[in-house]
């Protein structure tokens, strides 16, 4: 049987994605991160 029409069961919340690079010292390279909604995820 085909499904009857209904909206998707979730809402899409738009959030800012912020890329950042942080210098952590002359010989330690840099940390590159991705912050989603205030949480660093990568």
């Amino acid at each position: 049987d085909a499904e009857f029409r209904h909206d998707s069961g979730y809402e899409v919340h738009h959030q800012k994605l912020v890329f950042f690079a942080e210098d952590v010292g002359s010989n330690k390279g840099a940390i590159i991160g991705l912050m989603v909604g205030g949480v660093v995820i990568a």
Partner: antibody
Framework: QVTLKESGPGILKPSQTLSLTCTFS??????????VGWFRQPPGKGLEWLAH???????SYNPSLKSRLTISKDTSKNQVFLTITNMDPVDTATYYC???????????????WGQGTTVTVSS | DVVMTQSPLSLPVSLGDPASISCRSS???????????LEWYLQKPGQSPQLLIY???NRFSGVPDRFSGSGSGTDFTLKISRVEAEDLGVYYC?????????FGAGTKLELK
């Protein structure tokens, strides 16, 4: 407040085409997610879903009757129509229309029904 | 088609009694969006159906809290904690997940 009211011919002969109108108020079929469906109930029996039409003119039919059914709407007049071709005495029933609205913040159920219109098919 | 099987078909009660109606679907009515569109309607004598419960367990506006719905998958129940005179009529379960949309045969709640 939301109201729906069905109208039809009352009596018609076998092989004729039934034309039903659902006239409603308190909501608009131009509203995103809004829809109106048709149902019927033979005397002393249970309910059967027939068809549904959405604000964007998408339509859904009961496959067992699809070849005989046509649902349509006039958004500006707040009306939904159902035609059933080749009527037979077994199609004798009370015909109802009801509202159903899609949406995460909607009930998404038949929350308002019309009073029904009785249709008798007899030679 | 999804067959909705209600039991009992007749339910004699005394006012103030609890009542329970079972509804089983012939296959899962879990929609791909994660919702189960199982609804309960009451049709009082000479009237149109009226919505009581939607999405298994949600009471429609104005429905007394003595009505409750539960279940999942293929097994659903409507309970009335204490039957009142205005509750008498025929109760239909309904699935709105799969085409064709289908009703149960109805359960007649009547006085003993």
């Amino acid at each position: 407040q939301v109201t729906l009211k069905e109208s039809g011919p009352g009596i018609l002969k076998p092989s004729q085409t039934l034309s039903l109108t659902c006239t409603f108020s308190g909501f608009s079929l131009s509203t995103s997610g809004m829809g109106v469906g048709w149902f019927r109930q033979p005397p002393g029996k249970g309910l059967e879903w027939l068809a549904h039409i959405w604000w964007d003119d998408d339509k859904s039919y009961n496959p067992s009757l699809k070849s005989r059914l046509t649902i349509s709407k006039d958004t500006s007049k707040n009306q939904v129509f159902l035609t059933i071709t080749n009527m037979d005495p077994v199609d004798t029933a009370t015909y109802y229309c009801a509202r159903r609205q899609l949406g995460l913040r909607s009930i998404d159920a038949m929350d308002y029904w019309g009073q029904g219109t009785t249709v008798t098919v007899s030679s | 088609d999804v067959v909705m099987t209600q039991s009992p078909l007749s339910l004699p009660v005394s006012l103030g009694d609890p009542a329970s109606i079972s509804c089983r679907s012939s296959q899962s009515i879990l929609h791909s969006n994660g919702n189960t569109y199982l609804e309960w309607y009451l049709q009082k004598p000479g009237q149109s159906p009226q919505l009581l419960i939607y999405k298994v367990s949600n009471r429609f506006s104005g429905v007394p809290d003595r009505f409750s719905g539960s279940g999942s998958g293929t097994d659903f129940t409507l309970k009335i904690s204490r039957v009142e005179a205005e509750d008498l009529g025929v109760y239909y379960c309904f699935q709105g997940s799969l085409v064709p949309l289908t009703f149960g045969a109805g359960t007649k709640l009547e006085l003993k």
